[in-house]
């Protein structure tokens, strides 16, 4: 399967709308920072098939959509950036289902690579522990659109590596 | 291979101005901070102060507000320190090192070779 | 601003001495406090970041610990090339500030 070129630009256009919706300094969050243990190896270079991957991607994004789409978050960063970020996301998400579809069926995807998807689910779960401990504050959202920053990058160069094994 | 590329050694005189770089590649330049650090000659190192590249904003330690300026070129991945005019007191190795941000990630994990700094009349 | 204050300033051991430093921040940091490892002429280098955690690449002899204000840097087995300076830095708030350094010698 191969991803539109669009879907690449999307990603880009993602992380430029997470780099936007900063309000407050960084540099006054420090002591907020938090080891949300992300699932390195579920985007290492193992030899997982390409729907693995797809399907990795996919729950990432979903997980990404859902954490940005609570009325904390609506309340916590700015509603046009928000929505904005949602187009992107939904695109994404779109672009690899059909994916997911074309690479191994619908039927068995989701349960193939259980492990993958669960190490995914249970990374999002701390990360939306964390913010509940910190009572939604500025500095916890700031720590986390940093997080996802992150993951988002890494997400990115797995989708780069699969179309360079293409 | 991640580097930080630090300019050479600079000797000026008593208030000049200088302008010293630390240019990084092997990683994405806009993911850290860029700090600085100041070693005076046999003396221990001091935190002088902080940018995010991504967007330019900077934090100072107190001792040093003022009196340096840094700032960054995301363009071509390099980081500044600068004064405007240069006192004896001011020579030293300045050091540049990454920074994973609110990341959680080995703090400082890179540093620069230093500059060396000499000013003197 | 927070300080640290590293003891002793300087000490002289034996290769295969076990050696502790440690570190005492003003106020409560938790656990972010890094250690580096600095010989003359070169840039510092990371050993311990988060307390506890072992930068990579760095020997296993190599341990610290510590939270709140008192921390330890421990060298289970002194080699040749662990003479230098070491030197502590809070990582909980700016302006980051390190401990003055803690030189270690040959006996």
């Known amino acids: 399967c191969d991803l539109p070129q669009t879907h690449s630009l999307g990603n880009r256009r993602a992380l430029i709308l997470l780099a936007q919706m900063r309000r407050i300094s960084p540099f006054s969050c420090l002591k907020d920072r938090h080891d949300f243990e992300f699932p390195q190896e579920e985007f290492d270079d193992k030899q997982f098939q390409k729907a693995q991957a797809i399907s990795v991607l996919h729950e990432m994004i979903q997980q990404t959509f859902n954490l940005f789409s609570t009325k904390d978050s609506s309340a916590a960063l700015d509603e046009t950036l928000l929505d904005e970020f949602y187009i992107e996301l939904d695109q994404q998400l779109n672009d690899l289902e059909s994916c997911v579809m074309q690479e191994v069926g619908v039927i068995e995807s989701p349960l193939m690579y259980e492990d993958s998807i669960l190490a995914v689910r249970k990374y999002f779960q701390r990360i939306t522990l964390y913010l509940t401990e910190k009572k939604y504050s500025s500095c916890a959202w700031e720590v986390v659109r940093a997080e996802i920053m992150r993951s988002f990058s890494l997400s990115i160069n797995l989708q780069k590596r699969l179309k360079s094994k293409e | 291979e991640v580097q930080l590329v630090q300019s050479g050694a600079e000797v000026k005189k008593p208030g000049e101005s200088l302008k010293i770089s630390c240019k990084g590649s092997g990683y994405s330049f806009t993911s850290y901070w860029i700090g600085w650090v100041r070693q005076m000659p046999g003396k221990g190192l001091e935190w002088m102060g902080i940018?995010?590249?991504?967007?330019?904003?900077?934090a100072y330690s107190p001792s040093f507000q003022g009196q340096v300026t840094i700032s960054a070129d995301k363009s071509i991945s390099t980081a500044y320190l600068q004064w405007s005019s240069l006192k004896a007191s001011d020579t030293a190795m300045y050091y540049c090192a990454r920074h994973p941000g609110l990341n959680w990630a080995p703090d400082f994990d890179y540093w620069g070779q230093g500059t060396l700094v000499t000013v003197s009349s | 601003d927070i300080q640290m204050t590293q003891s002793p300033s300087s000490l002289s051991a034996s290769v295969g001495d076990r050696v502790t430093i440690t570190c005492r921040a003003s106020q409560s940091i938790n656990r972010f406090l890094n250690w580096y490892q600095q010989k003359p002429g070169k840039a510092p280098k990371l050993l311990i970041y988060a307390a506890s955690s072992l930068q990579s690449g760095v020997p296993s002899r190599f341990s610290g610990s510590g939270s709140g204000t008192d921390f330890t840097l421990t060298i289970s087995s002194l080699q040749p090339e662990d003479f230098a300076t070491y030197y502590c830095q809070q990582a909980i708030d700016l302006p980051f500030t390190f401990g003055q350094g803690t030189k270690v010698e040959i006996k």
């Open positions: 940018i995010d590249p991504s967007d330019s904003d900077t």
